[in-house]
């Protein structure tokens, strides 16, 4: 019952006389293990006997021993799942069916495997892709339906009988699905391989060729071209005729179209393999090639450079720069189309031949204004001398020359004056179009090259002008020598460096930052009155009366300048103290007596003290001594003392008389 058995093997095994076969085989039986295995050659079923008959190549006996003389056939399987067989060597008469009689505990089965043994080794098969095209890599496959562990073989590739250098990859398969040996070769066919024979040879272990397969390559390729010229010189003279032939050396498939190109541009109505140029002109010089196409694509031949020789044409001069800047380098180039190139040149400047100049180009390293003018040239080659062209103009430009500056006003110039300056030059190319002035200011330019400085500043010391075209040329700066009154006048206290105390020696300095002219006079002023005429004002012993608002003046022939006013403060101890009594110095008892301590001090008195006729300190510290109610016993002399941070001062005595009231007199 086939449903109980599952057996896998290749089906047919191929070999040749003297080789071997290896039959990969696996099985599975429903009830588990195999008990009996018999290998028949061409078995036939005897209906009467209900059993298979035929040559028994192998059977597993109960004791597990092989039948004698059957070492050639080996069962390499087991009783569970493997039924692999080996026959080594194999003979032609082994061809036919191998019958695998398999018996398990409850099931029986006969499996047939075809064995095909040829007399001689059969050839491998070369497999090619459907299309071979030049330079497109393909894989060539050589397949042999044979592989056996006991018999080593090799597959070798040859091209036109020569072993191919490319590395082939050989693989073998000995599986229940297939048995083969395969060689794969990666190959980029070239057009030259078209029609060539590729061979795959089968070699034995000794390298002997056993069999082979051959194929002819059909390599599709673009046309392969060569170009021929008659006459075979590619250098011709104007008016000659030339024929070019495009030879198609190979094309697969056949070519379909032909065209000719000159300098990469197709020539109209030229579609045959032959191109004839009658009476060539210089414009027909160039690189020619033919283009031929087939179904694979177009191909272009090598280029043929056709040179048409002619005498120089009318010349023109190319100047590297015009206008050229004075001092710069200028190159002159004579352009005169000719073939062959001109060998001698003649140069002209303003119609006169330039001596010693016979080259196509020459250089003037430092161009000068006199080099300006028209330059022309003549060129000659073996075919003649060309016409001299109209020439090219050289313009030499340069900055304004000899720039000077003139002060138009009469000198001397005083601060606040209006000054007019003019800027002059001797020559210029191109013409002067503007002027520049230094330093830059909000100044008026009433006309080109004239500058008007209104209300000129004291510090406008030097002015320079430039006349400008494309460049500016500066004149030497002109010193304006502006006269001005002294500037930066300040009072500086030299001594003392700290605050001024009465009796100090005091020195004041009158400083100024600048003056033009330098000769100056000094004046000191206090509260508007003139004090002295030196730069220093000295007080040997300053007194409070010297305090006040001081300023100094510095004058020169142009004018005078005053410093900021400074208040000189003299610090002194309280002085001129006196006691005053608002109600007079006679007071009736019971009334109020008010004594006031008056003083002159800087800084002001911050503390007062009062004393009586016995110099006894009174318990009062204010500026005012108030006795209320006053008594007759208060009669007597009083004085006060004032203190500031400089020192102390005291008043003279003042007498207070307190008289009895009418009531007191009445009681007595």
């Amino acid at each position: 019952d086939s449903s109980k058995w599952n057996i896998e093997h290749p089906g047919t095994i191929y070999a040749w006389e003297g080789a071997c076969v290896w039959v990969p085989c696996t099985y599975r039986v429903l009830d588990g293990a195999l008990e009996t295995f018999i290998l028949f050659h061409n078995p036939e079923y005897n209906q009467n006997m209900s059993k298979f008959e035929g040559t028994r190549l192998y059977e597993n006996t109960k004791d597990g021993k092989l039948p004698s003389g059957q070492k050639r056939v080996q069962f390499l399987g087991n009783k569970i799942n493997n039924c692999t067989l080996s026959i080594h060597p194999v003979h032609v008469n082994d061809s036919g069916q191998l019958g695998l009689r398999m018996v398990s505990k409850t099931e029986k089965w006969m499996e047939r495997i075809h064995l095909n043994v040829s007399e001689r080794p059969f050839p491998p098969r070369i497999q090619l892709p459907p299309k071979l095209q030049e330079s497109q890599e393909v894989t060539l496959t050589c397949l042999l339906n044979f592989s056996c562990y006991g018999y080593q073989i090799q597959l070798q590739w040859l091209l036109e009988g020569v072993p191919m250098r490319q590395a082939a990859v050989t693989s073998t398969s000995l599986s229940t699905k297939s048995v083969f040996t395969r060689s794969e070769l990666k190959f980029s066919p070239q057009w030259s391989h078209h029609g060539k024979i590729v061979t795959c040879e089968l070699h034995d272990v000794d390298g002997k060729v056993l069999s082979e397969d051959m194929v002819q390559l059909n390599v599709k390729h673009t046309p392969k071209l060569t170009i021929e010229v008659t006459p075979n010189e590619t250098t011709v003279r104007k008016g000659d005729s030339v024929t070019m032939t495009c030879k198609v050396n190979s094309s697969n498939p056949e070519y379909t179209t032909v065209s000719w190109l000159k300098d990469g541009i197709p020539l109209k109505e030229q579609n045959t393999l032959m191109l004839t140029l009658h009476k060539v002109t210089k414009s027909q010089s160039g690189r020619y090639c033919c283009r031929v196409s087939n179904d694979v694509g177009p191909a272009t031949s090598e280029k043929v450079f056709l040179q048409v020789q002619y005498a120089p044409e009318s010349s023109r001069v190319q100047i590297s720069q015009s206008p050229a800047v004075e001092g710069s380098e200028v190159n002159f180039l004579c352009i005169s189309p000719a073939n062959p190139l001109p060998t001698n040149y003649t140069w002209y400047h303003n119609g006169k031949e330039v001596q010693g100049r016979t080259e196509k180009q020459f250089q003037i390293q430092k161009i000068l204004p006199w080099h300006a003018g028209t330059y022309s040239c003549e060129a000659g080659n073996i075919l003649g001398i060309g016409e001299r062209g109209p020439g090219t103009e050289l313009d030499v430009q340069y900055p304004p020359k000899k720039v000077t500056m003139v002060i138009e006003n009469p000198t001397p110039i005083r601060e606040g004056d209006t000054v007019t300056l003019s800027c002059n030059y001797s020559s210029s190319n191109p013409i002067v179009n503007h002027y520049e002035w230094r330093p830059r200011g909000a100044w008026e330019e009433p006309s080109l090259g004239v500058l008007k400085i209104q209300n000129i500043g004291w510090n406008n010391t030097a002015v320079a002008c430039a006349a400008c075209n494309n460049w500016c040329s500066w004149a030497s700066p002109v010193t304006l020598n502006v006269l001005y009154a002294p500037r930066g006048v300040r009072v500086r206290k030299i001594k003392p460096l700290s605050e001024i105390h009465s009796g100090n020696s005091v020195s004041l300095q009158c400083d100024f930052s600048s003056s033009h002219p330098k000769e100056v006079q000094f004046f000191w002023e206090k509260n508007g009155s003139l004090l002295g005429k030196e730069s220093q004002l000295n007080f040997d012993s300053i007194s409070p009366e010297d305090a006040g608002s001081y300023s100094c003046w510095v004058n020169n022939s142009i004018g005078q300048t005053a410093s900021k006013a400074w208040t000189l403060e003299v610090l002194y101890a309280p002085r001129r103290l006196r006691v005053s009594m608002s109600q007079g110095n006679q007071v009736m008892e019971g009334k109020t007596a008010t004594l006031i301590c008056e003083s002159d001090a800087n800084p002001p008195v911050y503390s007062y003290a009062w004393f009586d006729w016995n110099n006894q300190s009174l318990p009062y510290s204010g500026r005012m001594l108030r006795l209320e109610p006053v008594k007759v016993q208060h009669s007597g002399a009083y004085w006060c003392q004032g203190t500031n941070r400089v020192g102390k001062g005291h008043s003279p005595l003042i007498t207070l008389t307190v008289y009895y009231s009418p009531q007191t007199i009445g009681r007595r």
Epitope: K495, L497, W566, T567
Partner: antibody, heavy 125, light 108 residues
Framework: EVQLVQSGAEVKKPGESLKISCKGS????????IAWVRQMPGKGLELMGI????????TYNPSFQGQVTISADKSISNAYLQWSSLKASDTAMYYC??????????????????WGLGTLVTVSS | EIVLTQSPGTLSLSPGERATLSCRAS???????LAWYQQKPGQAPRLLIY???SRATGIPDRFSGSGSGTDFTLTISRLEPEDFAVYYC?????????FGQGTKVEIK
């Protein structure tokens, strides 16, 4: 241009004497006070004293009184700072500076400007 | 003598930032008699401000001074690379004239 140019660096031994100078130019040297300022290595500025070249009146900072002598010669626009006996602790940079200033309103301002580039004095045994 | 105390001792800032330096006096400085100086390594000091708030000649307007009595401030509105230095305040209102110990402004 107002400028103060100081004498070059000095290397001395303890106990030796030294006199360094400061020359003024570009202004009336006699009418401006000159100050001497000490700066010990990596430290701040200390006013040592000031001199008025016009009459050589000198005021010392109490910390430096008796340690140094400040003098001036207005005829050659020079101010001087001198030591009679140097100590290692005198190692410092010494600057001279002009005392500028002006008075206006009720104030009189003073400042040090310009300064000399300094004289480095190194005292080491 | 009047003792001037500067703070902070070191100020770490980046270019473009604002710097505020303080100078405090032990007693009132009369008439705002206070100056500020800048000192770069290996150079002499340079006058920046006098009278607490007046800029010296040639000093850029990013430097400004303020204050009176005992508290004074130097402000650099936008630090430039060349402003990294040591800054000293100095009073000239009372003898002896004295300097602060300095504030170092360094690149952060």
């Amino acid at each position: 241009e107002v400028q103060l140019v100081q004498s070059g660096a000095e290397v001395k031994k303890p106990g030796e004497s030294l006199k360094i100078s400061c020359k003024g130019s570009g202004y009336n040297f006699a009418t401006y006070w000159i100050a001497w300022v000490r700066q010990m290595p990596g430290k701040g500025l200390e006013l040592m004293g000031i001199i008025y070249p016009g009459d050589s009146e000198t005021t010392y900072n109490p910390s430096f009184q008796g340690q140094v002598t400040i003098s001036a010669d207005k005829s050659i626009s020079n101010a001087y700072l001198q030591w009679s006996s140097l100590k290692a602790s005198d190692t410092a940079m010494y600057y001279c500076a002009r005392v500028g200033g002006y008075c206006s309103g009720t104030s009189c301002h003073n400042w040090f400007d310009p300064w000399g580039l300094g004289t480095l004095v190194t005292v080491s045994s | 003598e009047i003792v001037l105390t500067q703070s902070p001792g070191t100020l770490s800032l980046s270019p473009g930032e604002r710097a505020t330096l303080s100078c405090r006096a032990s007693q009132s400085v009369s008439s705002s008699y206070l100056a500020w100086y800048q000192q770069k390594p290996g150079q002499a000091p340079r006058l920046l401000i006098y009278g607490a708030s007046s800029r010296a000649t040639g000093i850029p307007d990013r430097f400004s001074g303020s204050g009176s009595g005992t508290d004074f401030t130097l402000t650099i509105s936008r630090l430039e690379p060349e402003d990294f230095a040591v800054y000293y305040c100095q009073q000239y209102g009372s003898s002896p004239w004295t300097f602060g110990q300095g504030t170092k402004v360094e690149i952060k």
